[in-house]
Interface confidence: low
């Protein structure tokens, strides 16, 4: 009696169970009563990442330099190429199909986390006692100058965008 279901890594065709092709290989011809499934390795620029009965391998992803992409990991016969973004850029999506420039943190904000090839800059507001007067993708909030340690007094209070201004103490005559 012909099978209605097949074991793992097999498929049902013409009332018989044939072996699937292993990752990195494509199907050339189904098995017969007398012959095993015929498989062929994917070419250098192609891959298949599962046990399969595909007659065509998939093309490796192209990391398009026009879109700021570069190869992070070269594809094999069993894995796709992994793209990442060039320095100063990060992916716009999880699949990294294009890149955009890293965000800069505006004055009043500092860098909480520096951008990577896959994630954008994370900014945070400078808390009281700290400031940032630049637009930067790298600089953290800096602490206000301590006038006291320089034997000076605060002449102008600091803000989240400006440092305090120190000056000499008024001496009584």
């Amino acid at each position: 009696e012909p099978p209605t279901a097949c074991r793992e890594k097999q498929y049902l065709i013409n009332s018989q169970c044939c072996s699937l092709c292993q990752p990195g290989q494509k199907l050339v011809s189904d098995c017969t009563e007398f012959t095993e499934t015929e498989c062929l390795p994917c070419s250098e620029s192609e891959f298949l990442d599962t046990w399969n009965r595909e007659t065509r391998c998939h093309q490796h992803k192209y990391c398009d330099p026009n879109l700021g992409l570069q190869v992070q990991q070269k594809g094999t016969s069993e894995t796709d190429t992994i793209c990442t973004c060039e320095e100063g850029l990060h992916c716009t999506s999880e699949s990294c199909e294009s890149c955009v420039p890293h965000r800069s943190c505006l004055p009043g904000f500092g860098v909480k986390q520096i951008a990577t090839g896959v994630s954008d800059t994370i900014c945070e507001p400078c808390p009281v006692g700290f400031f940032s007067n630049v637009s930067s993708a790298f600089e953290k909030c800096r602490p206000w100058t301590s006038c006291e340690t320089k034997d000076l007094v605060v002449q102008q209070a600091g803000t989240n965008k400006t440092d305090v201004v120190c000056g000499p103490q008024d001496r009584q005559r």
Epitope: E44, S45, Q59, Y62, P65, N66, L67, K74, C99, V100
Partner: antibody
Framework: QVQLVESGGGVVQPGRSLRLSCAAS????????MHWVRQAPGKGLEWVAV????????YYANSVKGRFTISRDNSKNTLYLQINSLRAEDTAVYYC?????????????WGQGILVTVSS | DIVMTQSPLSLPVTPGEPASISCRSS???????????LDWYLQKPGQSPQLLIY???NRASGVPDRFSGSGSGTDFTLKISRVEAEDVGVYYC?????????FGPGTKVDIK
């Protein structure tokens, strides 16, 4: 049909600046990578710059890096080339060209070109 | 940068006869997806360049079938099976694999 029309050329003194424009029509401008290519009188083609669909990525020939800036305004279907500190060797016909994308990589449609002459 | 060279730089041709232009790149323009990132352009006298062949061997839309491109890696050839008078001009190869993109110096084709 695809049309690319360059403008903004002319005679300019060395050291001055110039902005070339390229008005695009007949295709969805915001979906295409765009190039600038130039050709000095009697010479061959020289690739100058390229810009991605949304303007986030741009690349330049080493000979123009730092002086040339490619930009685009997708709302106006226009590509630009800002040329600063002009030199005699910048004298050329400047072409803007559309890139065919992944299916047809490289410039597939070209404008008629605009002449820039750098002379005192 | 990838340097492109062409030969010959000048090619006098006879109408009806075949013609062949060679283009060589200083490094391979064959990408791992199996495609050669090389284009051929023709610039007719007084005109803008026009795309003839893309990805090494594919004829662009509207290009007559007497034009064909072949080759892989670093060595490429543009063939015209039977030259016509309208084919005169300068032929350029261009690599579009990596920036900066680069053109060959051009081959000037004219009628003998």
């Amino acid at each position: 049909q695809v049309q690319l029309v360059e403008s903004g050329g002319g005679v300019v003194q060395p050291g001055r600046s110039l902005r070339l424009s390229c008005a695009a029509s007949g295709f969805t401008f915001s979906s295409y990578v765009m190039h600038w290519v130039r050709q000095a009188p009697g010479k061959g083609l020289e690739w100058v710059a390229v810009m991605s669909y949304d303007g986030s990525s741009k690349y330049y020939a080493n000979s123009v890096k730092g002086r040339f800036t490619i930009s685009r305004d997708n709302s106006k279907n226009t590509l630009y080339l800002q040329i600063n500190s002009l030199r005699a060797e910048d004298t050329a016909v400047y072409y803007c060209a559309r890139d065919g994308g992944k299916a047809v990589p490289g410039p597939d449609y070209w404008g008629q070109g605009i002449l820039v002459t750098v002379s005192s | 940068d990838i340097v492109m060279t062409q030969s010959p730089l000048s090619l006098p041709v006879t109408p009806g006869e075949p013609a062949s232009i060679s283009c060589r790149s200083s490094q391979s323009v064959l990408y791992s997806n199996g495609y050669n990132y090389l284009d051929w352009y023709l610039q007719k006298p007084g005109q803008s360049p026009q795309l003839l062949i893309y990805l090494g061997s594919n004829r662009a839309s509207g290009v007559p079938d007497r034009f064909s491109g072949s080759g892989s890696g670093t060595d490429f050839t543009l063939k015209i099976s039977r030259v016509e008078a309208e084919d005169v001009g300068v032929y350029y190869c261009m690599q579009v694999l990596q920036t900066p993109f680069t053109f060959g110096p051009g081959t000037k084709v004219d009628i003998k």
